[in-house]
């Protein structure tokens, strides 16, 4: 199936709420949107992210 | 509303260093790119870097490399341009541009900031 | 790195004639931007990915091309076009820009 980022981080965000909380850890963050500049890229139309 | 807003353009001299700061409003930072783009004083537009959403992917042209470095914080949603050995074909306009691209598309410099002025001169 | 040229320099064109901005690249490039400039303002993304219109463009505006040559067109020249459009190609690095056409009314 799909994976949706929004749930992703939701989850991600419940996660670090609770090592925090039970572990007395310390996660900053995770980008799920830190990807290269696309010079393979094809131009084309599309709705802007 | 989008918001950017770039700061620290100034008078130096060649050989100096300047730090140029662009704070932003309006959207999640850290899920764009970033770039920096100046305009001469004859108007032509060069491009002077271009960061990725987390940091990792930093791009320079050979004009620049070496002597400038492009960092954004996060948490301040904050982009940087560090400036040094400046040269007087450094002197510009300096423009903070959001950058909407993503691993397979890019949809262009899509917002600028009114930009800040550096001028190398002695 | 990719040179491109953007011809006329400068031009004018009446109310209501059609017009034709072009930009030409020494290398094959897979897509270009285009920005508008007018005086005393940033640049603003008009058309992005050879054909696609930015937010808020009117749709006199088209732009297409491939490989080494594209262009932008007006189809109905109003006097709020005027202005200096500038073209981007970010296939490879650098990126790179052309020197712009100042599209005047007459």
């Known amino acids: 199936g799909t994976i949706n980022v929004h749930d992703v981080e939701t989850q991600f965000n419940q996660y670090k709420t609770e090592a925090a909380s039970r572990y007395n850890l310390t996660i900053s963050d995770v980008s799920v949107s830190d990807v290269p500049f696309p010079f393979s890229a094809q131009s084309g139309a599309g709705v802007p992210g | 509303e989008v918001k950017v807003v770039e700061s620290g353009g100034d008078l130096v001299k060649p050989g100096g260093s300047l730090k140029l700061s662009c704070v932003v409003s309006g959207f999640t930072f850290s899920r764009y790119g970033m770039s920096w783009v100046r305009q001469t004083p004859g108007k032509r537009l060069e491009w002077v870097a271009t960061i990725s959403g987390g940091g990792t992917y930093i791009y320079y042209p050979d004009s620049v490399k070496g002597r400038f470095t492009i960092s954004r914080d996060n948490a301040k949603n904050t982009l940087y341009l560090q400036m040094s050995s400046l040269k007087s074909e450094d002197t510009a306009m300096y423009h903070c541009t959001r950058d909407n691209y993503g691993r397979n598309y890019d949809y262009g410099m899509d917002y600028w900031g009114q930009g800040t002025s550096v001028t190398v001169s002695s | 790195q990719i040179v491109l040229t953007q011809s006329p320099a400068i031009m004018s064109a009446s109310p209501g004639e059609e017009v034709t901005l072009t930009c030409s690249a020494t290398?094959?490039?897979?897509?270009i931007h285009w920005f508008q400039q007018r005086p005393g303002t940033s640049p603003k993304l008009w058309i992005y990915?050879?054909?696609n219109l930015a937010s808020g463009v009117p749709v006199r505006f088209s732009g297409s091309g491939y490989g080494t040559s594209y262009s932008l067109t007006i189809s109905r020249m109003e006097a709020e076009d005027a202005a200096t459009y500038y073209c981007?190609?970010?296939?490879?690095?650098?990126?790179?820009f052309g020197s712009g056409t100042k599209l005047e009314i007459k």
């Open positions: 990915s050879t054909s």
């Open positions: 290398s094959s490039v897979s897509y």
């Open positions: 981007q190609q970010r296939s490879s690095s650098p990126f790179t």
